[in-house]
Interface confidence: low
């Protein structure tokens, strides 16, 4: 007879994923004799900080660093204590500090710095807090999906690893500040900053990835709003019945607006806004964020980026899933292909504020949004993107995968930790048959 | 430093094709596009076409389709225009020009940043 | 295609003046860039994207605009600054210059 085994060790990583609106902590753990397996890697638990993103303490960095105490404090119970020094742990900041470090980087550094300074009073094993770039949050992003979702290689019953016939998922990321497209392609990349050459567990992926700065939810919301200001004396994209006082500082003070931005204005003056209902004009206004007019490739998408055609099935996750989520629960509507998206987008945006407060009682919050954001989504993906009714098909709008958030985290540890190797492992793995 | 050179000047005759040469020095070729560009006495600046030396992807203004024919040479960093069918409107200086770009807020704006002296093309009988 | 049209066509200043290129467009664009071009000389990038000053342009050159009409200021001109002066768009397709201003110093 032989001895019982214990399981084995587990092995944990943190991240703290420091996006515009919000940070989040993600904690992973794996078993430590399996590290070199696929979907091996799942979530142990997660916090949401509270208040903003890193990015709103620009004047105030040591409070960015205070922000996160109460879920390092959460880190230290859920992490058992014995692993705490061999633990990593990571933060990374995405668009909204991207968009602060063009515009203050002096704050930028400030607040990154605040942040470490708190990071490394605890007793993990920290490594580090940046800005990732736009490819790196959406190449992360896809390597988290495919991950999850073993689409890499797959443990075969008899020990041995193969190459599932399956492809890569695309991935679709909607932040508050920036939103990325990722998918493996055939295409020879046209704009050399587009293309990731991966090489995973022995399989070679060319990946075409683009992130769109300022296109993430909560700045084309405030985009839209100053477009509203310029043109109009109403919100087309908000319901008739609400109304708001807009104080300009908020909507001008983004990089994001600076477009709309009239050459002087109060920042501390209040504007009255109220909404109109209008999907017609709510169209028109979100197809203003889009320019097709150059393209110096032989395609395109938007605003001269290339990009090749949409090619496979694709995940949509963050405030995509978010968005048609909304669609199709609380508002009961169907969006299983383009055009129903599109009459969703304007069933929402035809809603009184009555209405729709009667269709989702408890008064969600961002209720005014939900308009803007479905026409968004609607025209980022057939018009901006190029998604048919066909390509449209393969897409899923899912946040979880494998019981684990979808986003840039896991693979951005993943890559750090070195848990995915380039290399395939040996023929034979773990399966003792003697 | 940056450099772009181009061959010397050509004299040749109505009907007769030129191939004219830019060789890069002092980036990674591959990584930018190559732009060609005429300019005839007295005439203004005209683009012609460009080139991705990574994937040999030519675009060309529908002005010069069948006029000119750009083409690289990878190992050689350099990258050729052939002009054909030569007439004396032809007569030009032709410059290469590097793409330069730069992300601003997501949108990729494009210049050419770095030019070649220019090479004298001369059609005359 | 867009056409650029530059004035004036020549310009005359002297040392130490401020003087103002402008260059329009028949339809909207985005953004341009200026190109300086000295006699004998490929052009050189002067501006890029409408008012950001390329590398190693000194901080006399600025540039503005929007729509269809687009400037080029020199705020002290020097004797080196005798050129032609061209704008160029690239936000339709063909991508086109203008016809260029000839500034000569006195």
């Known amino acids: 007879t032989r001895d019982i085994r214990e399981p084995p060790a587990l092995k944990y990583g943190i991240v703290l994923d420091a996006g515009s609106s919000h940070t989040s902590m993600f904690i992973y753990k794996w078993p430590a004799d399996k590290e070199n397996d696929t979907g091996i890697v799942g979530q142990h638990s997660s916090c949401d900080v509270p208040g903003g993103g890193i990015s709103s303490y620009a004047d105030n960095p040591s409070g960015a660093g205070q922000s996160l105490v109460g879920c390092l404090e959460q880190a230290l119970r859920d992490v058992p204590k014995e692993r705490h020094a061999g633990t990593p742990l990571y933060l990374g900041a995405t668009a909204g500090m991207r968009l602060l470090n063009l515009t203050n980087p002096e704050a930028s550094t400030s607040v990154l710095t605040a942040v470490t300074h708190t990071l490394t009073q605890y007793p993990f094993d920290f490594r580090g807090a940046r800005i990732l770039s736009g490819q790196e949050e959406g190449v992360f992003g896809w390597v988290t999906a495919n991950y999850l979702l073993e689409n890499f290689i797959k443990y075969g019953w008899v020990g041995r690893w193969f190459r599932p016939r399956k492809g890569t998922l695309g991935a679709m990321d909607l932040g508050g500040a920036s939103t990325q497209i990722t998918f493996e392609t055939t295409s020879p990349a046209e704009d050399r900053a587009s293309e990731v050459q991966l090489r995973l567990y022995g399989q070679h992926y060319r990946v075409y990835t683009h992130s769109f700065l300022c296109y993430g939810r909560d700045q084309v919301l405030q985009r839209l709003l100053a477009s509203a200001l310029q043109t109009h004396s109403f919100h087309p994209c908000w319901p008739r019945g609400f109304s708001t006082h807009v104080l300009l500082g908020d909507v001008y003070q983004s990089p994001c607006t600076v477009a709309q931005r009239p050459q002087t204005f109060n920042s501390s003056a209040r504007v009255s806004l109220s909404g109109s209902s209008d999907p017609h004009l709510c169209r028109d206004l979100v197809s203003g964020l889009f320019s097709f007019s150059s393209c110096p490739f032989s395609r395109c998408s938007f605003n001269g980026v290339f990009q090749p055609p949409v090619a496979g099935n694709f995940i949509a996750f963050s405030a995509f899933f978010y968005t048609v989520n909304f669609l199709r629960t609380s508002m009961g509507l169907p969006v299983a292909t383009l055009q129903q998206l599109e009459a969703a987008a304007v069933n929402v945006c035809n809603q009184t504020w009555a209405q729709l407060q009667a269709r989702v009682p408890g008064q969600q919050a961002h209720l005014a949004d939900y308009c803007a954001g479905a026409m968004f989504v609607q025209q980022l993906l057939s018009r901006g993107y190029g998604f048919d009714e066909r390509a449209f098909g393969g897409v899923i709008f899912q946040k979880k995968a494998a019981d684990t958030a979808v986003g840039w985290a896991l693979g951005y540890m993943l890559n750090l930790t070195n848990l995915i190797p380039a290399d395939p492992p040996g023929l034979r793995k773990g399966t003792d048959f003697s | 430093q940056v450099q772009l050179v181009q061959s010397g000047a050509e004299v040749v005759k109505p009907g007769a094709s030129v191939k004219i040469s830019c060789k890069a020095s002092g980036y990674t070729f591959t990584d930018y596009n190559m732009d060609w560009v005429k300019q005839a006495p007295g005439q203004r600046l005209e683009w012609i076409g460009d080139i991705n030396p990574k994937y040999d992807i030519s675009t060309y203004n529908q002005q010069f389709k069948g006029k000119a024919t750009i083409t690289v040479d990878k190992s050689a960093s350099t990258a050729y225009m052939e002009l054909s069918s030569l007439r004396s409107e032809d007569t030009a200086v032709y410059y290469c020009a590097r793409r330069g770009f730069f992300l601003y807020y997501g949108i990729n704006y494009y210049y050419f940043d770095v030019w070649g002296q220019g090479t004298l093309v001369t059609v005359s009988s | 295609e867009i056409v650029l049209t530059q004035s004036p066509a020549t310009l005359s200043a002297s040392p130490g003046e401020r003087i103002t290129l402008s260059c329009s467009a028949s339809?909207?664009?985005?953004?341009i860039h200026w190109y300086q071009q000295k006699p004998g000389q490929a052009p050189r990038l002067l501006i890029y994207?409408?008012?950001n000053l390329a590398s190693g342009i000194p901080a006399r050159f600025s540039g503005s605009g929007s729509g269809t009409f687009y400037t080029l200021t020199i705020s002290s001109v020097e004797p080196e600054d005798a050129a032609v002066y061209y704008c160029?768009?690239?936000?339709?397709?063909?991508?086109?210059f203008g016809g260029g201003t000839k500034l000569e110093i006195k």
């Open positions: 339809s909207s664009v985005s953004y």
């Open positions: 994207s409408t008012s």
């Open positions: 160029h768009q690239w936000s339709s397709y063909p991508w086109t």
